[in-house]
Interface confidence: low
């Protein structure tokens, strides 16, 4: 399918001239950012962005690649080098430390410099690094964390926690020896390390004592509380603030976000990670877009501004399963959240960044015809005289041999949401990839986001833009009309 107008050079020349005109009008703002939002697409490498763009277009009955994602409209772009101190290919813990704290760490550690060692509790103390969110709070801003994973998961934990093991969600996950040495689980750190105004995502079970039934799945013992210390962390958190509210379903969230008496809001909508968007029960669980909107409604009441972390955390999970359908539909919801946030904020006073912590070994190729389904087959056959999909993985659980050969695939099979794209190497879980990821920026000081940078640069841009430590002498003009 080739649109007739695209055969005419005028179409491309006119389009490029418009883009050039818009580029010439770009003026770096000399003002400080009152608000900071970082949108983190976990595992959202450039191939994921491209494939999601095509899917978003095709869902609107367009051909695909000519569509704009919300993040595509951000005027400034850089590349981020994602390696951790000890690994070429990182995990979400070490990367969270980089883009949220501005310092690189080791694989599977969070909020700690590389002097700390994975799983060695006694290397924690003295190696803590402080997140931009923490610094924003100290500067009087309201702060929030929104994710589709557990709120204690590696990426959000980078905003508030310091741990040598990203898997220490509750005290039941921490070895007794480490507990005796004083290492705290991530859920405990969530409520005790700093005052977070808005906490939205999954992770109920890590907050309640063992034996506490889950409100949504009361008959499923595996979904109930996991804590061994007998603590009800939600209750402890509520006791800290007069205007604190805890919610566990969508209806309560929407009510709380509009209630002026609510100053602090914790919403935990699943025992563990939230459901994939395609499985979500919208009567009970909010979407990432709805959680983002609720967070912005609360945080934007603060005249000093806010810091908000928003994570599309299950893009990564879809890829680990080699189920591109899940990863890409999660990416689209993530992009919808970015779009909604843009409608609710102003680029005059809000620096918005969109990035990924790392990529995945996810590829898009094979010369498919324009307009053909992103989940479809490449034209022609492979050397083994069988079809192959345009989306593939370098490794992962999609590797299958039937009678010693690669199975054939049909268009109807590859279009199924549960289809696992094939891979070259068999693994239980597909792996992250080590190539650079994109950073998109809009708002005050967004022009600093350029070139190829270390991932740590992201945290420093945010801190400088809002004149936070260590850039309190940033020499940026406050935006006209800003109140203190």
């Amino acid at each position: 399918i080739i649109p007739v107008e695209e055969e005419n050079p005028d179409f491309w020349n006119r389009q490029a001239a418009e883009a050039l005109g818009a580029a010439k009008k770009l003026q770096p703002a000399q003002t400080a950012a009152k608000n900071l939002i970082i949108f983190l697409g976990d595992g959202m490498g450039v191939s994921t962005v491209t494939a999601a763009r095509i899917l978003k277009g095709q869902k609107k009955d367009k051909l695909g690649p000519e569509t704009f994602l919300a993040m595509d409209r951000f005027p400034y772009v850089a590349l981020s080098k994602t390696y951790s101190v000890d690994k070429h290919v990182p995990d979400s813990g070490a990367t969270a430390t980089a883009y949220l704290c501005g310092v690189k760490g080791n694989f599977q550690t969070i909020g700690l410099s590389a002097a700390a060692r994975f799983n060695q509790c006694n290397t924690t103390r003295g190696n803590e690094v402080i997140s931009v969110m923490n610094r924003a709070k100290k500067a009087g801003k309201s702060v929030g964390v929104v994710t589709t994973t557990r709120v204690q998961h590696a990426s959000p934990a980078g905003a508030y926690a310091h741990t040598v093991n990203r898997n220490w969600y509750s005290d039941a996950d921490v070895p007794a020896s480490a507990r005796q040495e004083g290492c705290q689980d991530i859920a405990t750190q969530l409520i005790s390390n700093m005052d977070i105004d808005v906490i939205l995502g999954g992770g109920r079970k890590y907050m309640f004592p063992m034996g506490t039934p889950d409100p949504e799945y009361p008959d499923d013992y595996s979904q109930g509380g996991t804590r061994l210390d007998g603590k009800n962390l939600v209750q402890e958190w509520l006791a800290k603030h007069q205007g604190a509210r805890y919610v566990w379903n969508r209806t309560e969230l929407l009510q709380a976000s509009l209630d002026p008496s609510v100053t602090h809001l914790m919403g935990l909508f699943e025992p563990g990670d939230m459901k994939y968007e395609i499985h979500r029960d919208s009567t009970l669980d909010p979407s990432l877009m709805e959680m983002t909107e609720a967070a912005l409604l609360l945080l934007s009441r603060n005249p000093r501004g806010f810091f908000l972390f928003v994570e599309g955390g299950r893009i990564d999970h879809g890829h680990h399963e080699s189920r591109a359908y899940r990863a890409l539909t999660e990416t689209i919801m993530f992009d919808d959240a970015i779009e909604r946030a843009g409608q609710l904020t102003s680029e005059e006073d809000t620096l918005s960044l969109v990035t990924a912590d790392h990529s995945h070994v996810f590829s898009f190729g094979g010369y498919p015809l324009r307009g053909s389904s992103i989940f479809g087959l490449a034209p022609g056959k492979a050397r083994d005289r069988k079809a192959y999909t345009v989306l593939l993985y370098g490794n992962g659980p999609g590797y299958v041999l039937k009678d010693g050969a690669r199975p054939d695939v049909t268009e109807s099979e590859s279009g199924s949401p549960e289809y696992r794209q094939q891979s070259a190497v068999p693994l239980d879980g597909e792996t992250h990839a080590g190539e650079d990821v994109a950073v998109f920026a809009r708002g005050p000081q967004a022009h600093l986001v350029h070139g190829v940078q270390e991932q740590t640069f992201i945290a420093h841009v945010m801190a400088f833009a809002a004149c936070l430590e260590p850039y309190t002498a940033c020499d940026l003009a406050p935006r006209a009309g800003t109140t203190d």
Epitope: I278, R280, D281, S282, Y325, P417, E418
Partner: nanobody, 122 residues
Framework: QVQLVESGGGLVQAGGSLRLSCAAS????????IGWFRQAPGKEREFVAR????????RYDDSVKGRFTVSIDNAKNTAYLQMNSLKTEDTAVYYC???????????????WGQGTQVTVSS
Amino acid sequence: QVQLVESGGGLVQAGGSLRLSCAASGRAFGDYNIGWFRQAPGKEREFVARRTWDGSSTRYDDSVKGRFTVSIDNAKNTAYLQMNSLKTEDTAVYYCAAGRYSRVRGWEYDYWGQGTQVTVSS
């Protein structure tokens, strides 16, 4: 487009069982929610049960909880409603529907079957 065809209805005595089938054609269930609804004579259509295609979320109306089970066979592109311990008040035309998520209206059912009559006699 999805076409849905129900079957399996009929006359059964109270306390008996029936299994309704809902075959989809035109497109796989994919990311659809499968809902079962019923409409008794002179009453509004009411929700009975629903299930996501992968079974990660299932909901039942209180009136059928513990008696009815909804399942999906993705390979056959067919959804089922197993109805046990049937009561006279279960008499109705039963419809299956395929629903997708709309960010404006939440889950809504875009495609409906023609319905199958279930009559429970005492």
